[in-house]
Each structure stands twice: as C-alpha cells, then as structure tokens.
C-alpha cells in the first residue's frame, strides 16, 4: 500500500535549488531499484518532477497559491522488470501553503459619496471594501482592517466594515463643500508587517436649508411715473441665500405699508429676484411717495433648523411716484344743457369747467370742436367756459345739438381733453296749428240740415308740455249767413255740418269755408285754412253721382250719411 500524507508546499519559494515537496513510497519497495515511480496529473513533469527510483518529488518553479492553491496528481509504482503495477494508481493532493504576499485591494480606486451638511455625528456616508487575495482560512494574511489616513477630524471609518461616517458636528457646506478622504486597508489584522492598500473617497456635502434669505440692504428706493399701467415692473430687489437649488428659492411678499394695495411683488422664476410691480393706477396728485415692507422667505423650510431663527428677512421699499403732465380734467364726463328756441344771439346756455390735475395747475382755454358744430351755432368763452348762442335756434329743425368742447393747457397745447355737450332746445309756441291735410269734400243736393260732411284734423310743429289743445271756428267774415257750421269736438278735431235742408248746385256749385285753427299755448298761434265743399247730385243712399264740371280731388269715403 501507499505510504504518504497530504503534501504541503510553501508558495513563492525563492531558494536556488528545486523545492522539495515530499516522497512517494510503497511498502512493496525493497530499496533494490526494482520499482519505478511515475507521476501524472496537474503540472507533472513540468512543475513537479519525481525521482523514479526514490519517489522524491520536487517543485521546479515558484508557485503562487493565489493562482492555484491545490494541485491534484496521480502516483503509480510499477515493477521495472514486468512493467506491472505493484500498487493501484492513486490520486494525491499537493496543497500550496499561503504566505502573506498580497496587499488588500479596494473595489474602486476612487469612491464618490455625498452626505447632507449639518448631519449628526455618526451619519453613514459610504462603505468601502478591500479584498485580499491571500488565504482567509489560514492565519491573518487576509484579515483586513480599515483606518483613515486623511480626512480627520471630519470623517471616521469603522475598522472592520469599512463604513465611513461623519465625525464632526455641524459640517457646513457653505464653509466647505468638498472633502478628500484617504482610507487604508491593512491585512494581518492591522498588525506590524501587514500589507496595505489605499483608496480615495471624494465626499461632497449636499445642501440643506440651514440659511435664511438675507437682504443685502435694509432700504430700497424706486421711481415710477404716475402713468404706469397695472402690471408695470418698477424695480428689482434680491435677497441672497447661501443655500443652493430648492433651498435657495425665495418667495417675496408685501407685508405692510401704505402701498399694500397699490403694488405687488413677484419672484423672477429664474433669477430669484423680487420684482415690484404696479397693482393699481397711481395718482401723483393724490400720493407722491409709498413705503412698503417686503419680506423674503424660503418656501421650503426644514423644521430642525428653525432654532437658528426665522427663515425670512424684511426690507423697506420706498416708491416715489413721478408727476406726468396730464391733460385737463372736466368736472363732468358729459354736460347736458338746455335753452329756449327763442333765445337771442349771445344768450348764455351754461358753462363747462376743466382743471389741470397736475400740481402746476396750468391755466386752460376752452374751444368748440368745429367738426361737431359746422354751422357755428354755438360759441364758448375761451377763458371761463361759458357756452352761448351765435345763431338763432329752431327746435322744430333740430331738437338736440351734440357738440364737443376742448380744454387745452395754455402752456402746453399738446395736453388737451374733450367732453361731449348735449344741448336740448326747449319748445316755444312759435308755430300755428294747420290742417293735417288738404280738405275738399261734397254735400248732396238733398242733404238735411246738421248733417256731418267732413271731420277736420290739425297738426302743430310745436311740442307743448301739456300736449296740443286746438280750437276750430269759422272765420269771422264767413260766420254770419254761412251755409255750414263748424262743430269743435274738443278733442283736437272738428266737424263741418250742413246748416240748411237742400242745396242747389246750379245756384252754387262750390263753397269755400275759411276755418280758423288756434292753439291754447302762449302766445296763442292761429292760422286759417280753407275747406272746399262741392254740391253734388246723389242717389238715395247718399252716394255721389255727379257734381259740377270739375271732378273732386278726394271723393273717396266721403258721404252725407256720415
């Protein structure tokens, strides 16, 4: 039977001779050279050689456990004479024995990590890992211990885990943002003689909101013309915040001051500036200076830093409203005046007033826009704004006159404004009533007395306040001995009645009746109108059959039967 144990061989042998491994030996070997030892398997004949007579095995080359820790070979013992095995072929192992010939190597040459600024001591930053190729199962060649070579007192490393933690309180990004930490990994449990490797860890402190916004000055002053429309930007203010990104975002607000309703502040979404804007129309003559209290605050606040104080700051903004030369302002948006139509030329109707709203109170002059009064019916006193007539009026021609008056600053004619004037012409009884139409009627020869032969209507161009009241009568010269009578119906109509029984068209074919129509206003106006009455032959129904030679102009619908 074979007589050996497992063979052990120290790696990295540096001697000048071959390294002795061990001896293969069969109990059948009498030492007379009759047996031959043969080696096969991993590295046989190359790495490992055997003395075929003695069974001594030697390593011809320097071996590296980290390259190959175990070699499996086969041993044979044969009878030289017969060539037959005296032992069954057997497998055996050469185990390479570790020496500490490898330093720990980190998984990365450079690590990058971040940790929030102001973190508590002991906050996890990153874990570094180093591996050692030596045998972890034997001795301490692969037992790695971590230590910090650079980066104290800011950071520490756990010796066994490689976990890097913060080691200093209140590390402030605004003070210092970047740290380069050098970590060493040493084998042999960190003991003397151990091999070591290092890595660099670049640590960046990330921002937290630990700084409030701060105005660089306590007071700002801006100017804006009073004519600035709502929405106009008038100035920018900027609070600075040492933080970055979201933590440096600033919201501005107006918290106090007389300008609270007149101005607004918005945040420029790109530059984080506060833009003061006009909110309502300004008036230099009402208020020349406004004071605002503007607050800058962080919209996102971390409660754990509130102990540092409020995350906001205030500044005073003084806004000076600048005067703008404004046109005159009329006392009314429109004027309504009235005048009787019988007014004489140069009669004053009323007046307009306009004032320069500016502090200078420049004097104004008045004029009529002639495009609105082409016939020059009206005029205005350029100094006091009195409106007067320059021509006679007639309500019946034009009831309303719509004109425009212009007020112009004497010192600055470019500054002018306009106002509409609505002038109503009041009625005066200066028109007599007249027949509403031309009346020509007929009477039947056989007509009876008191028959209605025509109803009369009148019109009047005037427009009395209480309405028209007309009266009708025969003219005095026709009143006595007339063949017809006028009956006033008291409703602004009158009837023509026959006064006798029967008319003879051969005696008198046509009657002309002068009728006086009067109104009831002051002064009374009257006119005389003539009604033509023809005498006609009629049938028994009272329908006209024939008249005098001339035909009637308006015969339709007229009959004695009315």
């Amino acid at each position: 039977s074979w007589m050996w144990n497992q063979f052990f061989l120290l790696e990295e042998y540096t001697g000048s001779d071959y390294q002795y491994v061990g001896k293969l030996h069969s109990d059948q070997d009498r030492g007379d050279g009759s047996l031959k030892y043969i080696l096969s398997g991993d590295g046989a004949g190359d790495l490992f050689i055997i003395n075929e007579n003695t069974g001594d095995i030697q390593a011809t080359k320097r071996l590296d456990r980290e390259e190959k820790p175990v070699y499996i070979l086969r041993a044979q013992a044969i009878n030289r004479r017969t060539g037959r095995p005296v032992e069954p072929e057997s497998e055996f192992i050469i185990k390479i024995h570790d020496i500490n010939d490898n330093e720990p190597i980190f998984t990365k040459e450079v690590y990058t990590a971040t940790v929030p600024e102001m973190s508590d001591v002991g906050t996890f930053v990153v874990q570094v890992t180093a591996t050692d190729a030596d045998d972890p199962t034997y001795g301490n060649s692969a037992k790695v211990v971590y230590s910090i070579l650079q980066g104290q007192p800011y950071f520490s490393v756990e010796s066994e885990t490689g976990i890097i933690k913060t080691a200093l309180l209140n590390m402030d990004r605004e003070n210092r943002e970047q740290y380069q930490v050098v970590i060493q990994a040493k084998d042999m449990g960190g003991q003397m003689g151990g091999l070591s490797g290092t890595t660099t860890v670049n640590i960046t402190l990330t921002d937290v909101n630990d700084n409030p916004p701060r105005f660089p000055q306590s007071t700002y002053q801006f100017k804006t013309p009073e004519s600035s429309p709502p929405g106009t930007p008038i100035g920018r203010i900027k609070a600075s915040d040492a933080d970055v990104g979201e933590n440096a975002e600033i919201e501005y607000s107006i918290t106090d001051g007389e300008g609270l309703d007149m101005f607004d502040v918005i945040t420029d979404q790109e530059t984080q500036e506060g833009i003061i804007t006009v909110k309502k129309l300004l008036d230099f003559e009402k208020k020349k200076v406004y004071t605002l209290k503007v607050e800058a605050s962080n919209p996102y606040v971390e409660p754990r830093f509130l102990y540092l104080g409020p995350f906001k700051d205030s500044a005073t903004v003084r806004i000076v409203v600048e005067d703008v030369d404004e046109p005159p302002v009329f006392s009314k948006l429109a004027y309504i005046l009235q005048i009787r139509e019988d007014a004489q030329i140069n009669t004053t109707i009323g007046s307009v007033t306009a004032q320069d709203p500016d502090a200078a109170r420049n004097p104004v002059k008045y004029s009529v826009d002639r495009h609105t009064d082409m016939d020059r019916i009206f005029n205005i006193d350029s100094g006091n704004g009195s409106i007067f007539t320059s021509k006679l009026l007639d309500r019946e021609t034009l009831l309303w006159h719509n004109i425009t008056v212009i007020a112009t600053e004497i010192n600055n004619p470019k500054q002018s404004s306009r106002v509409p004037l609505y002038i109503k012409v009041l009625d005066v009884n200066d028109n007599a009533p007249e027949f509403a139409e031309f009346y020509e009627t007929f009477v039947c020869e056989k007509a009876k007395a008191d028959q209605l032969i025509q109803t009369l209507h009148a019109v009047d161009k005037d427009d009395p306040y209480s309405g028209h009241q007309f009266s009708f009568s025969l003219a005095p010269e026709a009143a006595s001995g007339s063949n017809f009578t006028i009956q006033d119906n008291k409703d602004n109509t009158a009837g023509i009645l026959t006064r006798k029984n029967g008319y003879n068209r051969h005696e008198m074919s046509t009657y002309l009746l002068p009728v006086v129509i009067s109104d009831n206003d002051y002064p009374v106006q009257s006119s005389t109108g003539t009604v033509t009455v023809r005498v006609c032959a009629c049938d028994h129904h009272g329908n006209m059959q024939s008249c005098h030679a001339e035909a009637l102009i308006h015969p339709t619908g007229l009959s004695t039967g009315a």
Epitope: P230, G231, P233, I266, D268, Q269, E270, T271, Q272, I275
Partner: antibody
Framework: EVQLVESGGGLVQPGGSLRLSCAAS????????MNWVRQAPGKGLEWVAR??????????YYADSVTDRFTISRDDSKNSLYLQMNSLKTEDTAVYYC????????????WGQGTLVTVSS | DIQLTQSPSSLSASVGDRVTITCSAS???????LHWYQQKPGKSPKLLIY???YLASGVPLRFSGSGSGTDFTLTISSLQPEDFATYYC????????FGQGTKLEIK
C-alpha cells in the same frame, strides 16, 4: 425691441433629424428661460421644451411627446437657442415658435414668426 | 400635468357684444401662472393678459381677465371687428400647457 428669428425648418423624412435655431436680440438673453412651442396645421398650441438660465444649471424640460427625441440647448455667447430633433415622426409636422417669457419669466410674451417643419415620406 | 379646458370651443358674436371665455384648470394654480393669448390666422400668438389680470402692452381696455384657483375668465366688454380670432389660456407650471382654444367668429 425684442426680436426672435427662427430658422432651420424644412421637409424631412420620418426617422430623420433637423436642427432649429433661434437668434435673439433686443434683450438680455442670459436672464430668461427660453421655450419652443409648436402648432400643427389647423390645431392648437403645444409647448415642446424649456431651458433655464446658467444660474439654474441650464436645466431642461420637455413635453412627454418629444422626450428622448428632442434636445433643447442654448449658447449665451451667441444669444441663440436651438432644438435638435431626432427620430422625427409625421405628427411632429408643425410650425415651431421660439418664445421668450415676460419679465419675471412668467407667460410667453415674445414669439418669433415661426418655422415650418414638415415630416413626410 | 395640469390640464386646461376652455369653454366654449367656438363662439359667434356681433360687434358690440360682451363676450366671456372661461378656462378651467385640473388643479389649483396661482393667478401669477395663468395667461391669455390671441391668435389670428397665419400669425404668431400674441400675449393679451398676463398673470390673470394684467393687460399686455398695447392691449385695449375692453379686454379684462379675472379668476383664481381653478377658474379663470377672459372678458371682452364690447367686441370690435379686429377681435375676431382664436383665444388660448396657458399655465406656467412645467410641463407648460395650453387650453384647446376658443374660436371667436362673426355672427
């Protein structure tokens, strides 16, 4: 006077690329975020992309419909805005406007005349 | 994403009419972030009202804006011939979004 002049539009096949440019003048380009907005023929307005200012690390934002295909960029030294359009689709056919916000970077106050991009085979 | 819904989508009106267009946001937004635009055919959009209330430069006083939270309104007090156009609302929170538009036509 604020002026925005777009160029680079034209006819391109589906899957093709095009680069639009916008030359800006009359204002301080470096203090404004800039946008591209498009309008397909007969359709409404659609925001495409925005790029912020240097202070904000030139952060970019895109409409879902163009993410991973379009890239907005700017060259502050040249007062220019760009839109690189790759993997173009027929539905990208539109007039593309270069747009500057109002003061404070609100709204879309100033628009270029637009440049027509037609994607068709 | 904040969706904006305009109402009505189209509207016929006459010169002199008072017109109101509403814009409803899917979630509450600051009035600072809501704006209105006018666009005429073949032209670039034009800022009309910014930050909900303020008239952009050169915009006539007949235009006004109001609202807060989720409901915003554009009003034209007396329509003029040049007001016939398409109107859009828009909000500023990324991703920026527009309403679908309201086309104002002559009756």
């Amino acid at each position: 006077e604020v002026q925005l002049v777009e160029s680079g539009g034209g006819l391109v096949q589906p899957g093709g690329s095009l680069r639009l440019s916008c030359a800006a003048s009359g204002f301080t380009f470096t203090t404004y975020a800039m946008n591209w907005v498009r309008q397909a023929p007969g359709k409404g307005l659609e925001w495409v992309a925005r790029i912020r200012i240097k202070n904000n690390n030139y952060a970019t934002y895109y409409a879902d419909s163009v993410t991973d295909r379009f890239t907005i960029s700017r060259d502050d030294s040249k007062n220019s805005l760009y839109l690189q359009m790759n993997s173009l689709k027929t539905e990208d056919t539109a007039v593309y406007y270069c747009v500057r916000p109002d003061y404070g970077n609100y709204g879309l106050a100033y628009w270029g005349q637009g440049t027509l991009v037609t994607v068709s085979s | 994403d904040i969706q904006l819904t305009q109402s009505p989508s189209s509207l016929s009106a006459s010169v002199g009419d008072r017109v109101t267009i509403t814009c409803s946001a899917s979630s509450s937004i600051s009035s600072h972030y809501l704006h209105w635009y006018q666009q005429k055919p073949g032209k670039s959009p034009k800022l009309l009202i910014y930050r909900s209330f303020y008239l952009a430069s050169g915009v006539p006083l007949r235009f006004s804006g109001s609202g807060s939270g989720t409901d915003f309104t554009l009003t034209i007090s007396s329509l003029q011939p040049e007001d016939f156009a398409t109107y859009y609302c828009q909000q500023d929170i990324v991703p920026l979004t527009f309403g679908q538009g309201t086309k104002l036509e002559i009756k």
